[in-house]
């Protein structure tokens, strides 16, 4: 008799990352009998929801259902119907919703209420929608990249199956850049974490980890740009802002009401004698860098060492994975190669920012102007944040690995979140049996 293929015994999970600028839906898959093994969960789909982040729906919450439809229907197609009822769905909202909650807890709850109502209409097993903390965002990002890099596996291998693998069990640090916040998370070397708020203790697969993490709210790339504009318009002599962070020849009108809409610009708010101003790009990396540095208060530190704004940061240790906008921006600028030194990155940024806007538009005809116009700022901001904010140096730059995906799964907090909420990261090392019963047919 011929051997019949057994139906694969797999499970699925869905996580929606409700970020400040957009929402993405991730579908994960894993073998049911290997739930506690490390490295078995992988991403099978990413669906980017068309439109802005959910916090922008605060005045039109009735549109959230339509907004989520395409990606939820995609999930319905990808996941076999027999698995729908068993598939958990989680939604985690990050700094965009943290900012909305700071303005109004009621409005933030209204958005999440409508999200739940919308997601409960699908055949999946909806588990909850919530605003995750900055600490969680950092921690889950760290768990994701180390899980995917095989750092929690006790088996040492003589061959490398993943990029960046140094065949030791030393974990990677995680650098995450979003639109509204940025996170830094790593295991410091024998260093006391001086501020309790930044300390996390994990026991994963039988090993203890003392992890440092901090999330800088308002220091994501979009909110940092709003901060910079609010700071610079204070000293503008009229309604023209000559801005070194935009290409020469670039022009854009900004409403003052939009500028002061976010809590991130409150510290720079003042009564201006105009309702609008015009950004005129002058494309100068050095001046842009200097302007960005003014967003980081380094004059005050109540600890042995700080990042900025009086936040404790231990000495950097080991290799780091830089993902999300760190990766997207550097990838666009073609600066993700391991061979590119920090000096070379700076040189390339100087050239890029100095290129005239008309030339840039021609060179990148397929890219939306809104995004295209901001790469000079974003690239400069990334350099400023990593070098002056987090104290990377020209030498330690080579320890930063700009990572989009690891083994087909996106680097980011969502996988770590799902692993935790589905209890798929055991505290103790699972007992390994020579052959699991599933081996026998």
């Amino acid at each position: 008799t011929q051997n019949k293929a057994l139906p694969e015994n797999v499970k699925y999970g869905i996580v929606l990352d409700a970020g400040s600028s957009h929402t993405s839906l991730y579908i994960y898959k894993w073998p049911a009998e290997k739930e506690n093994d490390t490295g078995v969960v992988h991403q099978v789909e990413e669906c980017r929801v068309k439109g802005p982040g959910i916090s922008k729906f605060v005045q039109k919450v009735n549109e959230i259902g339509i907004y989520l439809t395409d990606c939820m229907e995609r999930a319905r197609e990808v996941i076999p119907r027999s698995q729908h009822q068993e598939t958990p769905v989680y939604l985690g909202a990050t700094a965009g919703m943290r900012l909305l909650r700071m303005e109004s807890e009621e409005l933030a709850d209204r958005v999440l209420d409508v999200v739940e109502r919308s997601l409960s209409n699908y055949p999946f097993d909806f588990q909850g929608a919530r605003i995750i903390t900055g600490q969680e965002e950092g921690a889950y990002g760290w768990i994701t990249i180390n899980y995917l890099l095989g750092k929690f596996s006790q088996k040492t291998r003589w061959f490398s199956i993943v990029p960046y693998e140094t065949n030791n069990q030393e974990t990677f640090g995680a650098l995450d850049l979003g639109g509204a916040s940025t996170q830094v998370t790593f295991v410091p070397q024998n260093q006391t974490i001086e501020s309790p708020d930044n300390a996390l203790q994990f026991r994963l697969y039988g090993k203890d980890y003392n992890v440092y993490t901090h999330s800088f709210l308002c220091y994501g790339k979009d909110q940092a740009l709003w901060q910079k504009l609010a700071k610079d318009i204070q000293v503008a002599s009229n309604e023209i802002l000559r801005d070194p962070c935009f290409h020469p020849g670039y022009k854009k009108v900004v409403n003052v009401s939009d500028l002061y809409k976010t809590p991130c610009t409150k510290r720079f708010e003042m009564t201006l004698p105009f309702q609008q101003f015009e950004i005129q790009g002058i494309g100068n990396y050095q001046q842009c860098h200097q302007s960005i540095l003014e967003l980081f208060n380094t004059s005050y530190c109540p600890y042995s060492q700080c990042a900025f704004n009086g936040i404790f940061l231990p000495p950097l240790q080991g290799d780091f994975g830089a993902f999300s906008a760190f990766y997207f921006v550097m990838k666009f600028l073609n600066l993700t190669s391991e061979k590119v030194s920090q000096e070379k990155v700076t040189e390339m940024m100087k050239k890029f920012c100095a290129q005239p806007w008309e030339e840039i538009k021609t060179s990148y005809a397929g890219v939306k102007e809104k995004y295209l116009s901001e790469y000079c700022f974003s690239g400069t901001y990334i350099l400023s944040l990593l070098l002056q904010g987090y104290h990377f140096t020209a030498d330690s730059w080579e320890h930063i690995h700009f990572i989009g995906k690891i083994q087909g799964s996106d680097a980011g907090w969502t996988l770590g979140y799902m692993l935790n909420l589905t209890n798929m990261i055991p505290a103790e090392q699972p007992l390994s049996t020579p052959l699991s019963h599933s081996t026998y047919v």
Partner: nanobody, 126 residues
Framework: EVQLLESGGGLVQPGGSLRLSCTVS????????MGWFRQAPGQERDFVTA????????HYADSVKGRFTISRDNSKNTVYLQMNSLKPEDTAVYYC???????????????????WGQGTQVTVSS
């Protein structure tokens, strides 16, 4: 961890009504699915009903469908169980339950990590 405090139990005649309340302290209330379970003397603890964080998903045990209604008021951190057409077989200790980022369906299966209240006695007798 969240703490749960039930109230509203008591003695009621068959066919009567009762409303149980459960107030939650600590934690972000909307992040928890809430439920009610009951345990009659000498029996196991049974699922009665559960509701999702913002109240859009509910599940009921077949034995109470159409008679019991679960609801929640997130502004008061409170979940309610309205019990109508009570029968002697509804007599039990009723326990409030909270489960973080867990669906009502999983609560029904008693899956995941559940935090329990102390329980309140409901007696249906003439």
């Amino acid at each position: 961890e969240v703490q749960l405090l039930e109230s509203g139990g008591g003695l009621v005649q068959p066919g009567g009504s009762l409303r149980l309340s459960c107030t939650v302290s600590r934690g972000t209330f909307s992040e928890y699915s809430m439920g009610w379970f009951r345990q009659a003397p000498g029996q196991e603890r049974d699922f009665v009903t559960a509701i999702s964080g913002f109240g859009h998903i509910t599940h009921y045990a077949d034995s109470v469908k159409g008679r019991f209604t679960i609801s929640r008021d997130n502004s008061k951190n409170t979940v309610y169980l309205q019990m109508n057409s009570l029968k002697p077989e509804d007599t039990a200790v009723y326990y409030c339950a909270a489960a973080w980022q867990t669906s009502p369906r999983r609560m029904m299966q008693m899956a995941g990590s559940i935090t329990w209240g102390q329980g309140t006695q409901v007696t249906v007798s003439s």
